[in-house]
């Protein structure tokens, strides 16, 4: 469990031409408030999909009245943080929507009127317990500056808030493999249910008492790095210094290759590389001429007219060895870049790229917004394996160049009227309703139908809701 915290720094006109008109006037003074909606993962979800990680409303900001003739300044903001509690693990990747709302305070019949000024969205990676992350987002001509972080609520700790804390058993230190629970240094991480001593960095468990290792680590406690060089050849010169816990006697122990053949291990057995004039599984066959057809896989035999002179096999592409007996492991040259997985299909090489990379050899980094323009106030967002434009409302398409009619789907509930606006749609709600889509009923005294106010919030102020 933990809390996602959002701090709004400023909301005002963005840079460039076309400064927006102030949302408030002498005739219609207003104040701002904000709503944040969080969803797990990096999915491109519709704004209307549920805020599965949670949502929150800010308090209302100070009342603001436009000074005649003055350009719209940064608008006065509500005090405090927006806090979105999450009950389960922090997912690490999340999508957010931050809405700026205007509350008009004129003589409205039925109480104040709410309307959406701007909405920004994005997808981010964030570890719980880390520092504040700063961000700037634009919606039409407006610019929103904010910071956010995720922090764990005691007794949870860790980057996903999945580990637990407990009071120290000993006054000076924590137990085996357990760290102090920052910032609660007088508490310690609770013992994991994994196997005793299992590395919390490189081991994990899905059942009590087990210790399963992350890739690259081995041993009962996952404390030994796997070194592929020594693990492939445990008797080689490097094995004494790598610490690799390799299996027992290897298939090459005692060198099964005859006649000076050299042995190399394969995943299931061994393979002999034979000197010229010998072949067979263990290089045991000798006295070969081209008449014996020693070249495999379509290799061309040259020379070797009598048993005393060596023959040479000219191998076709994809094969090697003195008898063209070995398929070339083209993946051993590590042709796939950026951590791509190499697949040798025989007729061709394929690279299966990690998210964020593309190209025949995974050479193109997709997670790079440089030089990528999103039109109409859209924001380029990295992640999910490609660049994407997060478009301002009212625009769509790959580069946010397509104009949408946001009102076509009749999005305003409870009789709200829909207006196409420079920043997307705006719902003018019927008296008694509020929200981006007029979805929230409002009590007659102006308080929303939300949970009771927590300490520090006056009744009638918007609250968090989930």
């Amino acid at each position: 469990a933990g809390v996602f915290e959002l701090q709004i720094h400023s909301f005002g006109p963005g840079p460039g031409p076309g400064a927006p008109r102030s949302p408030c006037s002498a005739r219609l003074p207003c104040r701002l408030f904000f709503r944040v909606c969080l969803k797990p993962g990096l999915s491109e979800e519709a704004a209307e999909s549920p805020c599965a990680l949670g949502a929150a409303l800010s308090a209302r900001g100070p009342v603001y009245t436009e000074q005649p003739g003055a350009p719209a300044p940064d608008l006065p903001l509500p005090d405090g943080l927006l806090q979105v509690p999450f009950r389960d693990a922090w997912p690490g990747t999340f999508s957010f929507i931050i809405e700026t709302w205007r509350e008009e305070l004129g003589d409205q019949i039925g109480g104040p009127a709410w309307s959406l000024l701007a909405r920004v969205a994005g997808r981010r990676r964030l570890a719980a317990g880390g520092p504040w992350a700063r961000d700037i987002q634009r919606a039409g001509a407006w610019e929103l500056r904010f910071s956010y972080r995720a922090r764990c609520e005691p007794p949870a700790v860790g980057t996903a808030c999945t580990r637990l804390c407990r009071p120290r058993s000993a006054p000076s230190r924590c137990g085996p493999g357990l760290r102090p629970c920052a910032p609660l240094e007088d508490e310690c991480e609770a013992p994991l249910v994994c196997r005793a001593g299992c590395s919390p960095e490189h081991g994990f468990c899905e059942q009590p008492g087990e210790c399963r290792c992350l890739e690259g680590w081995t041993g009962p406690l996952c404390t030994v790095p796997v070194s592929t060089s020594s693990c492939l050849s445990p008797r080689g010169p490097s094995s004494a210094t790598t610490g690799c816990l390799v299996p027992g006697p290897g298939p090459c122990d005692g060198n099964p290759c005859a006649n000076g053949g050299s042995c190399s291990e394969t995943p299931r057995s061994f393979e002999c590389t034979c000197p010229r004039g010998f072949y067979g599984l263990r290089c045991e066959v000798s006295g070969v001429t081209c008449a014996d057809g020693p070249c495999f896989n379509g290799g061309l035999c040259v020379g070797g007219a009598d048993p005393d002179s060596a023959y040479i096999c000219h191998c076709p592409p994809g094969f090697q060895g003195s008898n063209c007996e070995k398929r070339v492991d083209r993946c051993s040259l590590q042709p796939c870049r950026n951590g791509g997985l190499c697949l040798d299909l025989g007729h061709a090489l394929r690279c299966r790229c990690r998210a964020g990379f593309a190209g025949p050899r995974c050479e193109h980094d997709l997670d790079d917004c440089a030089g990528r323009a999103c039109a109409n106030g859209g924001t380029c967002v990295e992640g999910g394996g490609a660049h994407r434009c997060s478009c301002a409302l009212g625009f769509g398409g790959r580069d946010c160049r397509e104009r949408a009619d946001p009102c076509a789907a009749r999005p305003c509930a409870h009789g709200g009227r829909c207006y196409a606006h420079f920043s997307g749609l705006v719902c003018a709600c019927a008296p008694g309703y509020m929200g981006a889509r007029c979805e929230f009923p409002v009590h007659p005294d102006g308080a929303s139908a939300l949970p009771a106010a927590p300490p520090g919030l006056r009744p009638g102020d918007p609250q968090r809701y989930l």
């Epitope: 196997r195 960095e201 030994v224 610490g243 816990l245 299996p247």
Partner: antibody, heavy 114, light 112 residues
Framework: QVQLRESGPGLVKPSETLSLTCTVS????????WGWIRQPPGKGLEWIGY???????SYNPSLESRVTFSADTSKNQFSLKLSSVTAADTAVYYC????????WGRGTLVTVSS | EVVMTQSPLSLPVTLGQPASVSCRSS???????????LIWFQQRPGQSPRRLLY???TRDSGVPDRFSGSGSGTDFTLKISRVEAEDVGIYYC?????????FGQGTKLEIK
């Protein structure tokens, strides 16, 4: 080739804290876990515990209330502190690569005496 | 914790003759991945321990092939096929299957 070298005072007074440092050369502290083992004079070996460069540690329960490990990646060193020592803590202290125990330091004798 | 018991504690051997050290554990050292995490060390006089065998029977590079390891479950043996003068020292078994790791008390090999 990986080499380990222990260093620290050879004499510690009873009830004080024993402090030793192990310097790793030929490998990065970040590549492995690292451990401490001790051997009282004329006796057998006892595993004290391990540390990873991030600070993750595991201690032998028989010593855990008195032991603290730390790591300094900038110096490629890791350290052992053993508090409230008695004569029973007199031993040769070795550092080693944890889990595999394939590389050991030469050891340093620490005597606890007033 | 797992108790490791070695025998004999002292082993006088004639040069060129075989030698055998036994190590017994109070719990099975067979781990769920199919490996037996038992290590054998040699400690020559005045030196640090040196790993000879790991995972029961895998010999370290540079270790003569006269050293071999065998056993399963809770009973293990280190064999030296022909003892040489340089083999004098104390031999320890160590289990790293269970936490905390534990050593045998050592077997002192000396030349008769």
């Amino acid at each position: 080739q990986v080499q380990l070298r222990e260093s620290g005072p050879g004499l510690v007074k009873p009830s004080e804290t024993l402090s030793l440092t192990c310097t790793v050369s030929g490998d990065s502290l970040k590549n492995s876990y690292w451990g401490w083992i001790r051997q009282p004079p004329g006796k057998g070996l006892e595993w004290i515990g391990y540390i990873y460069y991030s600070g993750t540690s595991s201690y032998n329960p028989s010593l855990e209330s008195r032991v603290t490990f730390s790591a300094d990646t900038s110096k490629n060193q890791f350290s052992l502190k053993l508090s409230s020592v008695t004569a029973a803590d007199t031993a040769v202290y070795y550092c080693s690569r944890e889990g595999s125990f394939d590389v050991w330091g030469r050891g340093t004798l620490v005597t606890v005496s007033s | 914790e797992v108790v490791m018991t070695q025998s004999p504690l002292s082993l006088p051997v004639t040069l060129g003759q075989p030698a055998s050290v036994s190590c017994r554990s109070s719990q099975s050292l067979l781990y769920s991945d199919g490996n037996t995490y038992l290590i054998w060390f040699q400690q020559r006089p005045g030196q640090s321990p040196r790993r000879l065998l790991y995972k029961l029977s895998t010999r370290d590079s540079g270790v003569p092939d006269r050293f071999s390891g065998s056993g399963s479950g809770t009973d293990f043996t280190l064999k030296i096929s022909r003892v040489e003068a340089e083999d004098v020292g104390i031999y320890y078994c160590m289990q790293v299957t269970h936490w905390p790791y534990t050593f045998g008390q050592g077997t002192k090999l000396e030349i008769k």
